[in-house]
Amino acid sequence: EEELQMIQPEKLLLVTVGKTATLHCTVTSLLPVGPVLWFRGVGPGRELIYNQKEGHFPRVTTVSDLTKRNNMDFSIRISSITPADVGTYYCVKFRKGSPENVEFKSGPGTEMALGAKPSAPVVLGPAARTTPEHTVSFTCESHGFSPRDITLKWFKNGNELSDFQTNVDPTGQSVAYSIRSTARVVLDPWDVRSQVICEVAHVTLQGDPLRGTANLSEAIRVPPTLEVTQQPMRVGNQVNVTCQVRKFYPQSLQLTWSENGNVCQRETASTLTENKDGTYNWTSWFLVNISDQRDDVVLTCQVKHDGQLAVSKRLALEVTVHQKDQSSDATP
């Protein structure tokens, strides 16, 4: 005759408030004859959680049909879990007796603890934009989780980061905890399309971590490079000068032309294009009138990008005699 074993496979069961908890208990023998009851706690003050035959237990249901002839599964479900339900639960076999049933064997117990899911991680970047090659800080926060053990990782474009500091508060016992992590990220010129991801893994998430993201486009400023060139061809007595503003971000840009120090108000043609890396190119064309009297034209293309100090590029116009002859109306 096989000796009865009471099997409660889970030592710890984490449950969420409002959800249903399943407490497992199986027996290895049908003997001795007698009921299996569930208790919370031990000793004379233990609380009866479920008695199949009598009493009122509206929140408890059985997983299997306890009246089936060879039933060995005495697992129960407790609905609408509250913080008052935490504790260690024991399934206990009784042997029928007179006048009272006699406790025969207890399972090892399953501790029910409240698990609370962490809130969705919120990632905040720096207040001001920074240029490439500089380091910026991102913070990630998540709140309201329990138990305290939690794992937080940082990624940039799928690559795990190592330069970060994480704190979980409070350090002592609490019903819920918060995590805050600060990561230091070195900006690359191509980071306009990059993302930083904060990933939080917790036992309540059952292997499906929560993620918070921030776009580096909010944190980066890529300053433009300027190039002013004179087109070799001219139309009549006009020379076309091009100012190419390359690889800048964000889009906010003001461009002005100056001729010999005087700001030109007249309309200029321009185009804006977006590069694959998310930066922008801006091309502006300026038509300069050429005459015999104008050998010393200096053109300046000035760019004010994203509220920063203006940068400019100058071009001294090269008007050759040959060009002047070409543009002259007089015949020799």
């Epitope: 004859v33 004379p44 003050g45 233990r46 609380e47 009866l48 199949q52 035959k53 009598e54 009493g55 009122h56 306890l66 009246t67 029928k96 006048p99 009272e100």
Partner: antibody, heavy 113, light 108 residues
Framework: EVQLVQSGAEVKKPGATVKISCKVS????????MHWVQQAPGKGLEWIGR????????KYAPKFQGRVTITADTSTDTAYMELSSLRSEDTAVYYC??????WGQGTLVTVSS | EIVLTQSPATLSLSPGERATLSCSAS???????LYWYQQKPGQAPKLWIY???NLASGIPARFSGSGSGTDYTLTISSLEPEDFAVYYC?????????FGQGTKLEIK
């Protein structure tokens, strides 16, 4: 819906035996203990005993031991309480209840010569 | 056997007042096994409070139960006309199961 329907009122002579039935519906009688409770006129509740219909195991209060027999027929989902050697003080309403939570409507037994 | 003694035997109060009904056990009863029933004339008892402090389905929140060991209490915070009835405490901690003699809550 859980229901416990008891048999009708009985008038018995002292020394006689009465057998009251309690027909249940909405659940399987084998799943629960069936209890019987006495209430004499103008008095409180007194537990008589109970049966486990699954295996017919019974427990009785010492006051009723020897005079009471509780049985159950699982094929008809009916519990019975039989009280013998009736005396006038047995005049009471008798209730069946399922596992202490759901009660029948009561059966009045009058013992009178 | 465990003897349950309820006090007072009769409690005369007016609607709106607070009612406190006591149940004292001759030996310790686990709180899981202490129930209260309400009974009105000509009706079967109804389960009112189970496991010392849990209200049965549909029971108003003005009712509450408390206690441990040998002393248990049913409290009604503000009496409503429909609350006037007889209340019984009941233990099923050990055989034979026993009831208190009841407290009759009557309108003053």
């Amino acid at each position: 819906e859980v229901q416990l329907v008891q048999s009708g009122a009985e008038v018995k002579k002292p020394g006689a035996t009465v057998k009251i039935s309690c027909k249940v519906s909405g659940f399987n009688i084998k799943d629960y203990y069936m209890h019987w409770v006495q209430q004499a006129p103008g008095k409180g509740l007194e537990w008589i005993g109970r049966i486990d219909p699954e295996d017919a195991e019974t427990k009785y209060a010492p006051k009723f031991q020897g005079r009471v027999t509780i049985t159950a027929d699982t094929s008809t989902d009916t519990a019975y309480m039989e009280l013998s050697s009736l005396r006038s003080e047995d005049t009471a309403v008798y209730y069946c209840d399922r596992g202490l939570a759901y009660w029948g409507q009561g059966t009045l037994v009058t013992v009178s010569s | 056997e465990i003897v349950l003694t309820q006090s007072p035997a009769t409690l005369s109060l007016s609607p709106g007042e607070r009612a406190t009904l006591s149940c004292s056990a001759s030996s310790s009863v686990s709180s899981s096994y202490l129930y209260w029933y309400q009974q009105k004339p000509g009706q079967a008892p109804k389960l009112w409070i189970y496991s010392t402090s849990n209200l049965a389905s549909g029971i108003p929140a003005r009712f509450s139960g408390s206690g441990s060991g040998t002393d248990y209490t049913l409290t009604i915070s503000s009496l409503e006309p429909e609350d006037f009835a007889v209340y019984y405490c009941h233990q099923w901690s050990s055989y034979p199961y026993t009831f208190g003699q009841g407290t009759k809550l009557e309108i003053k």
